[in-house]
Interface confidence: low
Amino acid sequence: KEEQTTFRDCAEIFKSGLTTSGIYTLTFPNSTEEIKAYCDMDVGGGGWTVIQHREDGSVDFQRTWKEYKEGFGSPLGEYWLGNEFVSQLTGQHRYVLKIQLKDWEGNEAHSLYDHFYLAGEESNYRIHLTGLTGTAGKISSISQPGSDFSTKDSDNDKCICKCSQMLSGGWWFDACGPSNLNGQYYPQKQNTNKFNGIKWYYWKGSGYSLKATTMMIRPADF
């Protein structure tokens, strides 16, 4: 049997026998275009493709539509994998989304959605989510039904303001909604009463900016 040399996601890499967490090269579906991603092979059985990570404020997340489309940052640290890749990938197969959160008091929580996909760019990478479970709130902190993605230069929210400009970062803003994991990073002791921080309302409430976040996806049938 010929060994697989290209992988569409980290689950395929894991199943090929490469079970160490780290940076791997993925290939766009139906294409030869490649992208580097961090694969978490440890959490919950492994095979997770990390699509977002925040941990120290080293990367500016107030980026353009093009940058959020193509991805930015470093897969070894803070980064955004890229809306186009995620849209294509999640349009081919059913994926789950796991969001891991850390606060400044040493607590951790997660939200797990049993079906996640992004629409194409023509639909502003609108997010679709169903089936929430987890410890980071019984209500989804990503507004339901899903919103279009907005950035500082592409305002697609439901607000008479410009959420991305006001709250910082690209996100699926509603008006503006109960979350923004791409907001301004605030260090400890400066992380409360922050309007534009890294927020997950139904876990930490209003104005609390989180210490670390990870968004990761995996095929539902993994």
């Epitope: 709250l167 803003f173 008006a175 009463n193 209003s206």
Partner: nanobody, 126 residues
Framework: EVQLVESGGGLVQPGGSLRLSCAAS????????IGWFRQVPGKEREGVSC????????YYVDSVKGRFTISRDNAKNTVYLQMNSLKPEDTAVYYC???????????????????WGQGTQVTVSS
């Protein structure tokens, strides 16, 4: 019945002050973010200020920063907008609104608001 009632508007000279009140009945304001909006005939409605549900985070549009102050008194189920150093361009009908989802703490300018008051006229003129 859920109701928001604004009061405190009126005619004031440039440089003067007014204090608008937004009183809620039928629900407890402390669970919701409250926004103040204003509208001039023929122009788009503008978000002026808001205050979050629990921790008092506030937002102000640039044109009123340093002049307007929003506050809330949960015991009285009322939100206030203290307007100082008023200018002719502040002339408008002022509305308060809240979102029943309770989470619009972060934008204060959203279209998600579903409870609205009837408005109070503010006129700044000499």
């Amino acid at each position: 019945e859920v109701q928001l009632v604004e009061s405190g508007g009126g005619l004031v000279q440039p440089g003067g002050s007014l204090r608008l009140s937004c009183a809620a009945s039928g629900f407890a304001l402390d669970y919701y973010a409250i926004g103040w909006f204003r509208q001039v005939p023929g122009k788009e409605r503008e978000g002026v200020s808001c205050i979050s549900s629990s921790d008092g985070i506030t937002y102000y549009v640039d044109s009123v920063k340093g002049r307007f102050t929003i506050s809330r008194d949960n015991a009285k189920n009322t939100v206030y907008l203290q307007m100082n150093s008023l200018k002719p361009e502040d002339t408008a009908v002022y509305y308060c609104a809240t979102d029943s989802g309770g989470y619009i703490d972060y934008d204060c300018m959203g279209l998600g608001y579903d409870y609205w008051g009837q408005g109070t006229q503010v006129t700044v003129s000499s």
